[in-house]
Interface confidence: medium
């Protein structure tokens, strides 16, 4: 809770604040971990402390490390750290994992990016704007105050976005960037009760004996993201896992897919060397969320080998 | 050195309102915050809620929300806690305590308030 | 709601004896758990804060540890001075006390 991750790229400017929870009123001391060193309040040095900021105008690799804060009262004292990374700057366009603040969701109705840490900053507007590394363009984005807003969202619109503005401090500039993830989401979802599309209600499959056999349970949910929704085979009315023959497996893990904008998930049962008593058993595929279960049941005949009409 | 000092032992009717003060000395009441604990006779300890004097900002534990107040008067540097709709369950030992938003470290002496018909 | 579940509700041990209460709350809640003692007719006291870190003044045979949701207040070496009710307080969301572990010399 009072220790914090800070990173930011060398010859930018970074300000990182002091994790814990201080008044304005409150002294703050700052050094620097490693070697109890105090960090200097004179502005004049390139990493220097302002009460709840430490700041690093610019930032270069050799200043990563972990930095304590401790907030005084005249009741207390009470310590904070600040682990920060600098990283040397990428050559291609790329932004790693490692610089990314937390993704954002936006929808149509909402489409809001907020430039994260900024508030830390004195800077002034405009802000620049970057997807993918290029300069965003055209009438659909608007740099307002901290936020970026996108008009009309599109799935498209998905993506990197990467907030690039000037601090100022004592009359010189330093640049910050900060990028951050933004992801669509459907606003328009909703769930229903659950729709096998395959296989049909009694459904006789014909297979042959000694082969291999695949039978696909799938099933639509509703549109957008669901949650609680699970499609899975029965044999005999028991789960795969406890019937106990090792040749019927279900495929592991849940193909989810997007059918004309509905969310959709499937299973396939395999069933290696088929045999006769495979044909006694009954074959249920199962559906469920949280409006209720539909079963589909699916039996198999045998096919003859030089039966070869379709 | 620092010192929190509570006004006397009270006793009141069921349904009355009790309030109860805190004065500080040795430290500006709004360079803290300022919490208010409760405790029952031969029981345990039970926070009440948070002042932060400086910008009135306060925040009540479920169980006594709506029926206590907190305040701070930054001029005299003295918290007040304010409980009504009295019952025989709230005979107790009132604590006020400063400290920072997430513990007490310094405490008054307490202030009994027995309610009795 | 944050739940404290603290335990023992009561101990009797030896002086010089190596003494733990214990805290276990039903959400992770990071380090922001605090212990306090109150002796008999006493006002309660911060012994250790956030933790792990001892206040000063405090005698260095308390300590405290654990992480997420549970928690632990050690007593290296009873001394009779000791004898005391010690509470846990969480404060990740609002602040609750435990139920209190009233502590006597045998």
């Known amino acids: 809770k009072f220790s914090k991750q800070s990173w930011g790229l060398e010859n930018e400017a970074l300000i990182v604040r002091c994790p814990r929870q201080g008044k304005p009123s409150y002294t703050v001391d700052w050094y620097y971990s490693q070697t109890n060193k105090s960090i200097p309040t004179q502005e004049r040095n390139r990493v220097f402390a302002s009460g709840q900021l430490l700041k690093f105008l610019p930032a270069a690799v050799a200043d990563s490390g972990i930095y304590t804060c401790i907030v005084r009262s005249p009741t207390f004292n009470r310590t904070g750290y600040a682990n920060v990374t600098i990283y040397k700057k990428q050559s291609d366009c790329n932004v790693p994992d490692y610089l990314m603040y937390s993704t954002v969701s936006g929808s149509e109705k909402n489409s809001k990016i907020y430039c994260p840490t900024i508030d830390l900053y004195n800077w002034t507007a405009p802000l620049e704007w970057f997807k993918n590394c290029q300069a965003l363009q055209g009438s659909r984005y608007r740099a307002h105050k901290s936020f970026l807003v996108i008009d009309n969202v599109m799935t498209e619109d998905a993506g990197d976005y990467t907030c690039k503005f000037i601090h100022n401090e004592n009359g010189a500039n330093y640049s910050v960037t900060a990028t951050r993830s933004f992801t669509v989401k459907d606003e328009q979802g909703f769930s229903l009760f659950p729709v096998i599309g395959a296989p049909a209600q009694n459904e006789i499959k014909e297979v042959e004996i000694g082969k291999n056999a695949n039978l696909t349970c799938s099933a639509c949910f509703g549109k957008g993201t669901q949650f609680l929704a699970a499609v899975l085979w029965q044999l005999n009315g028991t789960k795969i896992t406890d019937f106990g023959e090792p040749r019927i497996q279900q495929e592991e893990g849940q193909n989810q897919s997007f059918s004309n904008g509905l969310a959709c998930l499937d299973m396939v049962l395999r069933i290696a060397d088929v045999k006769e008593e495979d044909l006694l058993l009954q074959y249920d595929c199962l559906a469920l969320n949280l409006h209720g279960l539909r079963r589909h049941t699916v039996r198999l005949s045998r096919k003859n080998p030089i039966d070869h009409h379709s | 050195e620092v010192q929190l000092v509570q006004s006397g032992a009270e006793v009141k009717k069921p349904g009355a309102t009790v309030k109860i003060s805190c004065k500080v000395s040795?430290?500006?009441?709004?360079?803290?915050?300022m919490h208010w604990v409760q405790q029952a006779p031969g029981k345990g300890l039970e926070w009440m809620g948070r002042?932060?004097?400086?910008?009135?900002?306060?925040e009540y534990a479920e169980k006594f929300q709506g029926r206590v107040t907190i305040t701070a008067d930054t001029s005299t540097d003295t918290a007040y806690m304010e409980l009504s709709s009295l019952r025989s369950e709230d005979t107790a030992v009132y604590y006020c305590?400063?400290?920072?938003?997430?513990?007490?470290?310094?405490w008054g002496q307490g202030t009994l308030v027995t309610v009795s018909s | 709601d944050i739940q404290m579940t603290q335990s023992p509700s009561s101990l009797s041990a030896s002086v010089g004896d190596r003494v733990t209460i214990t805290c276990i709350t039903n959400?992770?809640?990071?380090?922001?758990i605090h212990w306090y003692q109150q002796k008999p007719g006493k006002v309660p006291k911060l012994l250790i804060y956030?933790?792990?870190t001892l206040r000063p003044g405090v005698p260095s045979r308390f300590s405290g540890s654990g992480s997420g949701t549970d928690f632990t207040l050690t007593i290296s070496s009873l001394q009779p001075e000791d004898v005391a009710t010690y509470y846990c307080?969480?404060?990740?969301?609002?602040?609750?006390f435990g139920q209190g572990t009233k502590l006597e010399i045998k």
């Open positions: 305590a400063t400290g920072d938003f997430y513990a007490m470290d310094y």
């Open positions: 040795a430290f500006n009441i709004k360079d803290d915050y």
């Open positions: 002042i932060d004097p400086a910008i009135g900002n306060t």
């Open positions: 959400t992770d809640i990071d380090d922001v």
């Open positions: 956030e933790g792990n």
């Open positions: 307080l969480q404060s990740d969301n609002m602040l609750t």
